[in-house]
């Protein structure tokens, strides 16, 4: 999940004129910039969210926006300031012609503009089976801790409160913004308007087919009775969620986001800002069948993005389109014919899909992660969501080829016990955007701000890659790939873990001169090796084949290709322990796995040798995969020879800590 | 079609700064790598930088810390920023795009630019 | 980084006749090479790239062979248009890219 992700138009207005005299004119050179949504239907212009620079104070985003309506009045236009912001970002929302744009990204403070556009509720008109743990039955369904310490807001159409599913487990709030809904001989209906919140309230906590039984939730009306809404709307939502824990500050939040719109980089950061003050989101992939990373806020990659699967554990088609999936995608949970609480009566049960459904079941089981441990970081929260879930089971052939190996094999489940996964090194895998196809593209992954990178691959569909490094950026280090000359482009693939009071460094080797191969290893005391990577400037490695095998008694090294840079992930934290396990293969062939044993959490993922016919290497779960150009254009020579190289760790600091809890 | 259009060459004394301009039509530069490549006399042909389509920019050891490269998606054109100008920087410059899968492709016109005193 | 010499320095040769131009390496580029020409008060122009694989517009007399570090741009048959200079570049190792020192083909 990245912001720098797709056919999102981001229309730049270089503006250096010193118009008006402005007393604070931007510095000469600085550009704000324009961005509307690429789906053309969906956007609303006339309507602007001015987001001002990370610093403003209120009073000067109120500042700007007078200056705004004095300099649109002196040329004869009428402007109106339907919002302040703050609290989440600062700027404004101002209703005016888009004759003003270029006026108004000369403002001082001013970051960018977004044209306001809408979005939409993410549903169509055997769940517990899936999430259950298997030594429970759905049907005496008693989870260990109803998420009563956990306060869950619904961002949703309006919801009937008085449903026995959810009565006396909603709180319905005064917040209201909706647009007007289309058509002219549109009939508002109470049950019609209040049909996908109510649904949804029960999944996430209704009194007989709710996740979380326990779980209390607050409601905002963010869409209108068609499931129509907008990302100005939403994002005064997410201010007033904002403002409230400021003013009343609970236990843990759950933000549930049931609706998509397209890529909007305000509405992302504004999810991003709300997460940063440990608050956990959850919203819907969409149900376009389409990538995640173009919808909003499911790109967001602060925020838990959930697919829809099926009682079978496939993909949920819906009409012509289906559940959204790629890299933006955190997992997959129960999102096709879901029974949950009706409108029609406060009796009425109705079965609903898409994946509103989903991120509620998965809003639903956070609440009940952070109801058993308060103190979860949502970093926490998202490695044990992905920990807990069920792998492998999604029949991968539905969604399109390129995004196979991008989109999470993951369904959600609920923690066998809510307690006691203390002792676990957690690791996830993060996938960049893809790079594009010049010679000097390359592509970055990031971890969470509390998550350690602890390796980082890469791979490339046409093999034309120049490897990868870890390197700092603004403090952290992030996975950077990069593309080859003629390649298609190429994807780094962060290596994302958990580790408490870590200090890892990054320990290179240049290219060596000499035939043996370039080595590095893990000097300093204390340090493992959590993982290798390389990086070569030439755009073809020679068939040079480093001595795979390490010599004994030195696991803490990295093996490369003589023209190839090398770099070692060094870390020391308190109880870590790794270990390298190889599985090679000698005849060519097209993937080369090699997995951890229980216990131990792969940490680092490469191959040996580096040379071209290798596309890459990725990790899935706690298997390593190595993946090899199609055999037939290798041919059985020695060349095709292939080894999968896996750091396994565990931490047993973790482990006695756990024990002393228990 | 592809053009590149260049403009901002001169004389400058040593030590002066000049900027170089390249527009580009035809096709849209923040989706290419753009190079600078310049051409003297005494040395032949000689890559000055560039600018990848994902941003990161490369010197060669000559110029490094004294020209700085760069884009402006806007007004679909790549710069060239010249400080502490020396008399060996004398050349005519071109600005160059490099296809996905060819090498330098298109070329601009070519702009002289002469330091002297 | 990488050297690259060509020779002749200067090649005269009648109009019609075949010319062969050279183009060494100081390590291998493996087949990341390309040829250009140019004439006089114009851009350089691309000929040859992947050592053998001609530009779009580039007529059939043109010609490249080699890899590794030795390698040839053949003119089967020159046309007065092809007088000019003619240029390698490496583009395997960067940065930097690196250019030959250039052959004059000349009118003999």
């Known amino acids: 999940q990245e912001d720098e992700d797709g056919d999102y138009e981001e229309l730049v207005l270089a503006l250096r004129s010193e118009e008006d005299g402005l007393a604070e004119a931007p510095e000469h050179g600085t550009t704000a910039t324009f961005h509307r949504c690429a789906k053309d239907p969906w956007r609303l212009p006339g309507t602007y969210v001015v987001v001002l620079k990370e610093e403003t104070h209120l009073s000067q985003s109120e500042r700007t926006a007078r200056r705004l309506q004095a300099q649109a009045a002196r040329r004869g236009y009428l402007t109106k300031i339907l919002h302040v912001f703050h609290g989440l970002l600062p700027g404004f929302l101002v209703k005016m012609s888009g004759d003003l744009l270029e006026l108004a990204l000369k403002l001082p403070h001013v970051d960018y503009i977004e044209e306001d556009s809408s979005v939409f509720a993410q549903s169509i008109p055997w769940n517990l089976e899936r999430i259950t743990p298997p030594r429970y039955r759905a049907d005496e369904y008693q989870p260990p801790d109803g998420g009563s310490l956990v306060e869950v807001y619904l961002l949703d159409t309006s919801i009937q409160s008085d449903h026995r599913e959810i009565e006396g487990r909603v709180m319905v709030t005064d917040f209201e913004n909706v647009p007007e809904e289309d058509g002219t001989r549109f009939h508002r209906q109470a049950s019609k308007c209040d049909s996908h919140g109510t649904h949804l309230a029960g999944v996430v906590s209704g009194r007989d087919a709710g996740v979380a039984k326990g779980a209390s939730m607050r409601s905002l009306r963010v869409l209108n009775c068609q499931g129509k809404g907008t990302v100005s709307g939403t994002l005064i939502g997410l201010e007033f969620i904002r403002k409230s824990q400021l003013v009343q500050p609970v236990g843990p939040l759950v933000v549930l986001l049931p609706l998509a719109g397209g890529y909007s980089r305000v509405l992302n950061a504004a999810c991003q800002r709300l997460a940063r003050a440990g608050v956990v989101l959850v919203t819907a992939a969409g149900n376009f069948r389409d990538d995640a990373c173009l919808y909003s806020p499911a790109s967001a990659p602060e925020v838990i993005t959930v697919g829809a699967t099926n009682a079978q554990d496939q993909p949920v088609t819906l009409g012509t389109l289906g559940t959204n999936f790629g890299r933006c995608v955190d997992l997959f949970a129960p999102g096709e014919d879901i029974i949950g609480a009706s409108s029609d009566c406060s009796t009425c049960f109705v079965s609903q899909s898409g994946t509103s459904q989903a991120a509620a079941h998965v809003a639903g089981i956070a609440a009940m992660m952070l109801s058993a441990e308060p103190e979860l970081t949502l970093a926490e929260l998202r490695q044990r969501l992905i920990h807990f879930s069920a792998k492998d089971v999604i029949n991968e052939a539905w969604f399109p080829e390129d995004q196979r190996v991008l989109t999470p094999n993951l369904v959600a489940a609920l923690p066998p016990s809510t307690h006691g996964a203390g002792w676990q090194l957690f690791c996830r895998t993060v996938w960049s955007a893809h790079s594009g196809p010049t010679r000097m593209a390359t592509a970055v992954a990031r971890c969470a701000p509390d998550e350690e990178l602890l390796s980082c691959s890469s791979f490339s569909r046409s093999g034309k890659r120049r490897g990868e490094r870890m390197e700092a950026q603004g403090g952290k280090l992030v996975c950077r790939a990069h593309n080859a000359f003629g390649g298609e482009g190429v994807y780094a693939i962060a290596r994302c873990c958990l580790l408490p009071q870590a200090n890892c460094s990054v320990h290179t080797a240049p290219p060596a001169e000499a035939s043996m191969g370039t080595r590095v290893h893990c000097h300093q005391q204390g340090h493992v090796l959590t993982g290798c990577s390389s990086h070569w400037e030439v755009e073809d490695l020679g068939t040079h084949k480093p001595p795979v095998l390490r010599p004994r008694g030195q696991p803490n090294q990295c093996v490369g290709h003589r023209e190839a840079s090398i770099h070692a992930s060094c870390c020391h934290a308190p109880g870590l322990e790794c270990k390298v396990k190889e599985h090679g293969i000698p005849a060519p062939q097209e993937q080369v796995t090699v997995a951890c044993e229980e216990g131990w959490t792969l940490t680092g993922c490469s191959a040996l040798p580096g040379t071209s016919h290798v596309l890459g290497a990725y990790a899935v779960d706690n298997t390593c995969v190595v993946r090899s150009r199609d055999v037939s254009t290798t041919g059985s020579t020695s060349e095709g020879a292939v080894t999968a190289v896996a750091i396994c760790c565990r931490s047993r600091h973790l482990a006695q800590a756990s024990q002393e809890l228990q | 079609q592809v053009q590149l259009v260049q403009s901002g060459g001169g004389l400058v004394q040593p030590g002066g700064s000049l900027r170089l301009s390249c527009a580009a039509s035809g096709f849209t530069l923040s989706s290419y790598d753009m190079h600078w490549v310049r051409q003297s006399t005494g040395k032949g042909l000689e890559w000055v930088s560039a600018?990848?389509?994902?941003?990161?920019?490369y010197y060669p050891g000559s110029v490094k810390g004294r020209f700085t490269i760069t884009r402006e998606k806007a007004k679909n054109s790549v710069y060239l920023q010249m400080n502490s100008l020396r008399a060996g920087d004398t050349a005519v410059y071109y600005c160059v795009r490099e296809g996905w899968e060819v090498p330098f492709d298109y070329w601009g016109q070519g702009t002289l630019v002469t330091v002297s005193s | 980084d990488i050297q690259m010499t060509q020779s002749p320095a200067t090649l005269s040769v009648s109009p019609g006749e075949r010319a062969a131009l050279s183009c060494r390496a100081s390590q291998s580029v493996s087949s990341n090479l390309a040829w250009y020409h140019q004439k006089p008060g114009q851009a350089p122009r691309l000929l040859i790239y992947?050592?053998?694989t001609r530009a779009t517009g580039i007529p059939a007399r043109f010609s490249g062979i080699g890899s590794g570090t030795e390698f040839t741009l053949i003119i089967s048959s020159l046309q007065s248009e092809d007088f000019a200079f003619y240029f390698c570049q490496q583009y395997n190792n960067w940065p930097p890219f690196t250019f030959g020192p250039g052959t004059k083909v000349e009118i003999k």
């Open positions: 600018i990848g389509s994902t941003g990161d920019t």
């Open positions: 992947g050592a053998s």
